[in-house]
């Protein structure tokens, strides 16, 4: 990673997953080791992300396992890059009226999307559901990330940064739990009744404010429109 990276030394240590959610399914944005970006129906080690806020609503998104920044080319294709280019790897974050988040390139104006079509963001537009995201805390045990949590006094600082360049696995104070309004009791994923609000189990876990260290009421996200 270049020294100029805005991610190195970040004090925000929470891993989150960005996912799209329609009435019946959800896909988690994942950045693979080869830089390919796609969606998975469940949390994976490649969908564990770190999101860092910058000024004026800009964010930088990084795949923890791939150690790649989420970037966009001039055609609107998203990809993961080891190199941080401020023009291609920063996104404008906006929360829509429905509470879902959209991310678009200030350089090329295209939306970050798990759909294959490339669409420019226009104020007031209603993007397709695969361009609207919710966030969710990481539920994958850190051991699955295959990156040892550095043990104190046993490795040099250089070793630590090499094994954990994004500083996401070092022990930190736990994030504040989501407020009660964000973490209601949900029905079983196998509940097929028409009133089951989360039949695919995709909204388990409290919503998080993905761009700050803790969650307050402003960190709540709507529950997806599940039957």
């Amino acid at each position: 990673y270049p020294n100029a990276s805005p991610l190195l030394g970040s004090s925000w240590g929470g891993l989150i997953h960005l996912y799209t959610a329609t009435a019946r399914n959800s896909y988690h944005l994942q950045i693979h080791k080869n830089g390919h970006v796609d969606g998975a129906p469940h949390q994976t080690i490649y969908s564990a992300l770190m999101i860092r806020s910058e000024d004026a609503g800009f964010v930088v998104i990084t795949g923890v396992m791939s150690r790649r920044y989420l970037c966009m080319d001039f055609r609107g294709n998203i990809f993961g890059s080891h190199y941080f280019d401020p023009e291609n790897c920063r996104f404008q974050h906006q929360t829509l009226e429905n509470g879902y988040d959209v991310y678009h390139s200030p350089q090329y104006h295209f939306l970050v999307s798990l759909g294959r079509a490339k669409r420019a963001f226009l104020p007031g537009m209603n993007p397709p559901p695969y361009s609207q995201f919710l966030s969710r805390r990481n539920e994958i045990p850190l051991i699955h990330f295959n990156t040892p949590i550095p043990r104190r006094h046993t490795q040099s600082a250089e070793d630590d940064s090499e094994r954990d360049p994004l500083n996401v696995l070092k022990p930190r104070a736990r994030m504040t739990p989501a407020p009660a309004s964000c973490s209601q009791e949900l029905p079983s994923a196998e509940d097929n009744s028409p009133m089951a609000s989360d039949p695919l189990g995709v909204v388990r876990g409290g919503r998080v404010n993905t761009h700050a260290g803790g969650t307050g009421p402003e960190g709540c996200r709507p529950f997806a429109k599940f039957i």
């Epitope: 397709p128 559901p129 695919l200």
Partner: antibody, heavy 117, light 106 residues
């Protein structure tokens, strides 16, 4: 190449159950939701339900609540759809289809289920 | 749930004709609309996704347009292999299909 291969045609009596299988190959099975869609003779397409391949969680169209059960076997990359309490109006071709976020890109060849006394 | 209506329900056309099929959603669905072609005894085939994006391998005579509630599938010059039934499907909320439009030979 991606392939979805379904089980063969079935003839069932009213009140019985039928279980249709769909074996996936050519891609990572757990990376895509699978849907079931049916088509009665001379009629349109009707979405029945969806299954999450990794968790096995399912969600069905309200019309089929309580009658349809979708399961999967990750070891064989196969999804199953069981429809119970069959009636004559369940006579249809049943399709499995792979979800790729913005469309169903691959479909099985279809399984004809005939319900007749 | 969002309902889709297609018009016409059937049409007769000749090879070389320009054919237009419309799909209307009961509420706005952004661009989350797909078009499929189905021939007798066969599974549906994906033609258009995200309202106006052509699926790989589909001839360029097929095109889609629209956003919100009104969508159109156009075949610029009908070919013999295009006689089939066409379905729209929305991806905004559930996965509802339209009732279909049958295109047959005049």
């Amino acid at each position: 190449q991606v392939q979805l291969v379904q089980s063969g045609a079935e003839v069932k009596k009213p009140g019985a159950s039928v279980k249709v299988s769909c074996k996936a190959s050519g891609y990572t099975f757990t990376n895509h939701y699978m849907h079931w869609v049916r088509q009665a003779p001379g009629q349109g397409l009707e979405w029945m339900g969806i299954i999450n391949p990794i968790s096995g969680s399912t969600s069905n169209a309200q019309k089929f609540q309580g009658r349809v059960t979708m399961t999967r076997d990750t070891s064989t990359s196969t999804v199953y759809m069981e429809l119970s309490s069959l009636r004559s109006e369940d006579t249809a071709v049943y399709y499995c289809a792979r979800d790729i976020v913005d469309a169903f890109d691959f479909w099985g060849q279809g399984t004809m289920v005939t319900v007749s006394s | 749930a969002i309902q889709l209506t297609q018009s016409p329900s059937s049409l007769s056309a000749s090879v070389g004709d320009r054919v237009t099929i419309t799909c209307r959603a009961s509420q706005g669905i952004s661009s989350a609309l797909v078009w499929y072609q189905q021939k007798p005894g066969k599974a549906p085939k994906l033609l258009i996704y995200d309202a106006d994006s052509l699926e790989s391998g589909v001839p360029s005579r097929f095109s889609g347009s629209g956003s919100g509630t009104d969508f159109t599938l156009t075949i610029s010059s009908l070919q013999p292999e295009d006689f089939a039934t066409y379905y729209c499907q929305q991806f905004n909320d559930y996965f509802t299909f339209g009732p279909g439009t049958k295109v047959d030979i005049k």
